[in-house]
């Protein structure tokens, strides 16, 4: 008799990441008897929820259960009705959130409370919404990452999963940029790591690793923009600010209520004489570097070295994959390609921001005005924080790997998240079966 | 101090809907959240849903689900619960329960006197 | 959803001595626990929340403690309005959901 397939014995689970611009929903997939195995989860779905994120519902909470609908409803229609009531839902809030509970914890929790009760409306197996702390997001994303590539299994793999991957097993160091924060994670080399705030230690399938991660609030490319239009606005003669970071011609309005919003520009407040300025672009790569500069304070470090503002940082060791907004302007501006060093980078960042206003609008004319104005900054942002904060060279540029998804599956903390909670990630390695005889009969 | 008083018994047909008020007073009425919860006779209590009355958004026990609708007036301080299809085994007493720990702390601190509501044909 | 053990069920005890109960939860609640006392033909009461915070008016022979999944209500001396049924509940995540109680009576 030929043998029949059984239906299939799957496991779902679905991860909010609330970030501080907007909300994305991941729908996980697994096979229930595999579930300690390593890489076999895998993204069905993303659902990137419209509208802001959730911390800009503050004053319009009873905004957030149409605002989470379509991206739940379309899980209800995806994962399969008898598989609901045991398919777990996690929330995780990010720096936009953390911000919002330093300014007040009473206005954080008035959102979270809405938005659990909200979900916990569905007919899944609800586990609650929580503000991650920038040690998790670092964490969890370096495991998604090296979960994806197949960095845990114990079987070195003939065959690459990915193009830049190399077949040994030395985990990949994770970059994760966001709009309100910056994450670095990696295993540094025979390195202690001089400061216990920055240090983990996990045992993932029978393996130690000591691992280093910090979370920079307030450096995410959103919140580094608020920063250096604050302090720039400090030395503005009048209510024009001149700003190398826009493309030439671009003009913008900003309210001086809006730019001290944010707790991230409280070191730079000041009463000033006018309540909105306009930003007017000039288009000036040097320029806009030299001035995002000023954001990381280097003259100060207790350790034997630091990125910036005083927080340690190992020497860089091994390849590093970089995603979230690192990836999305890296892909926008064209220079994700292993094959683009830096100095080609940079080249292209400076011809870039010189490039005209009403050029840039002609030429990506499908895209948000909103958004395209600001990939000058970003991509600068970028080559700044990496070069000058974290001290990759030109040399060592080679070992980023831009990376929007890996095997299928986002890059970022919310797969690793789920594997935690969900208990898949096993200290020791599990005892593998010379052959399973599950799927057939 | 707050006080929760709840409408009064009622004797439903089955298939019909029973709607119970609880009316606060002495004390905040918008912030914090409304939860009724029933007890059938002889056994324990089993929650049913909640409601800020602030926001007007309420969820369920997934039993409950489209049987059970919960809303707040603001300008009496009073919330109410609709139990529609009615059963025999919805016969019960339901009270309502203030959450008095403010958002994200759903301790029911304050007790209304129950309703019982008794469904026969 | 968070499924909440009581026991025992019942426990009898004499006026003066010491009651002791317990509550597990099927997933950890952290310290999201609640006990509740219910006499017959009455709403239920308070006692403590927070796992181990009496609530106002609660007297001090009532104290609770545990946290994540195993939790402890202790009488220190039972007087004779204590006999009643002991309800605990967890408030981390929706829906609340309620021990099966336990009924303290004299013994």
């Known amino acids: 008799t030929q043998n029949k397939a059984l239906p299939e014995n799957v496991k779902y689970g679905i991860v909010l990441d609330a970030g501080s611009s907007h909300t994305s929903l991941y729908i996980y997939k697994w096979p229930a008897e595999k579930e300690n195995d390593t890489g076999v989860v895998h993204q069905v779905e993303e659902c990137r929820v419209k509208g802001p994120g959730i911390s800009k519902f503050v004053q319009k909470v009873n905004e957030i259960g149409i605002y989470l609908t379509d991206c739940m409803e379309l899980s209800t229609e995806l994962i399969p009705t008898s598989k609901h009531h045991q398919t777990p839902v996690y929330l995780g809030a990010t720096a936009g959130m953390r911000l919002l509970r330093m300014e007040s914890e009473e206005l954080a929790d008035r959102v979270l409370d809405v938005v659990e009760r909200s979900l916990s409306n569905y007919p899944f197996d609800f586990q609650g919404a929580r503000i991650i702390t920038g040690q998790e997001e670092g964490a969890y994303g370096w495991i998604t990452i090296n979960y994806l590539l197949g960095k845990f299994s114990q079987k070195t793999r003939w065959f690459s999963i990915v193009p830049y991957e190399t077949n040994n097993q030395e985990t990949f160091g994770a970059l994760d940029l966001g709009g309100a924060s910056t994450q670095v994670t990696f295993v540094p080399q025979n390195q202690t790591i001089e400061s216990p705030d920055n240090a983990l230690q996990f045992r993932l399938y029978g393996k130690d690793y000591n691992v280093y991660t910090h979370s920079f609030l307030c450096y995410g490319k959103d919140q580094a923009l608020w920063q250096k239009l604050a302090k720039d606005i400090q030395v503005a003669s009048n209510e024009i600010l001149r700003d190398p970071c826009f493309h030439p011609g671009y003009k913008k309005v900003v309210n001086v209520s809006d730019l001290y919003k944010t707790p991230c520009t409280k070191r730079f407040e000041m009463t000033l004489p006018f309540q909105q300025f306009e930003i007017q672009g000039i288009g000036n790569y040097q320029q806009c570097h030299q001035s995002i500069l000023e954001l990381f304070n280097t003259s100060y470090c207790p350790y034997s070295q630091c990125a910036f503002n005083g927080i340690f940082l190992p020497p860089l060791q091994g390849d590093f994959g970089a995603f979230s907004a690192f990836y999305f302007v890296m892909k926008f501006l064209n220079l994700t390609s292993e094959k683009v060093s830096q100095e080609k980078v940079t080249e292209m960042m400076k011809k870039f921001c010189a490039q005209p206003w009403e050029e840039i609008k002609t030429s990506y004319a499908g895209v948000k005005e909103k958004y395209l104005s600001e990939y000058c900054f970003s991509g600068t942002y970028i080559l700044s924080l990496l070069l000058q904060g974290y001290h990759f060279t030109a040399d060592s540029w080679e070992h980023i790997h831009f990376i929007g998804k890996i095997q299928g599956s986002d890059a970022g903390w919310t797969l690793g998240y789920m594997l935690n909670l969900t208990n898949m990630i096993p200290a020791e390695q599990p005892l593998s079966t010379p052959l399973s005889h599950s799927t057939y009969v | 101090q707050v006080q929760l008083v709840q409408s009064g018994a009622e004797v439903k047909k089955p298939g019909s809907s029973v709607k119970v008020s609880c009316k606060a007073s002495?004390?905040?009425?918008?912030?914090?959240?409304i939860s009724w919860v029933r007890q059938a006779p002889g056994q324990g209590l089993e929650w049913m849903g909640s409601?800020?009355?602030?926001?007007?958004?309420?969820n369920y026990a997934q039993k409950f689900q489209g049987r059970v609708t919960i809303t707040a007036d603001e300008s009496t301080s009073t919330a109410y619960m609709e139990l529609s299809s009615l059963r025999s085994e919805d016969t019960a007493v339901y009270y309502c329960?203030?959450?008095?720990?403010?958002?994200?702390?759903?301790?029911?601190?304050?007790w209304g006197q129950g309703t019982m509501v008794t469904v026969s044909s | 959803e968070i499924v909440m053990t009581q026991s025992p069920a019942t426990l009898s005890v004499s006026p003066g001595e010491r009651a002791t109960l317990s509550c597990r939860a099927s997933?950890?609640?952290?310290?999201?626990l609640a006990w509740y006392q219910q006499k017959p033909g009455q709403a239920p009461r308070l006692l403590i929340y927070?796992?181990?915070t009496r609530a106002s008016g609660i007297p001090a022979r009532f104290s609770g403690s545990g946290s994540g999944t195993e939790f402890t209500l202790t009488i220190s001396s039972l007087q004779s309005e204590d006999f009643a049924v002991y309800y605990c509940?967890?408030?981390?995540?929706?829906?609340?959901?309620f021990g099966g109680g336990t009924k303290v009576e004299i013994k």
């Open positions: 409601i800020i009355p602030e926001f007007g958004i309420a």
């Open positions: 002495g004390g905040t009425f918008s912030k914090y959240g």
């Open positions: 927070g796992a181990s």
């Open positions: 509940q967890q408030y981390l995540l929706w829906p609340l959901t």
């Open positions: 997933q950890s609640v952290g310290s999201n």
């Open positions: 329960a203030r959450e008095s720990g403010g958002y994200r702390d759903h301790r029911l601190g304050v």
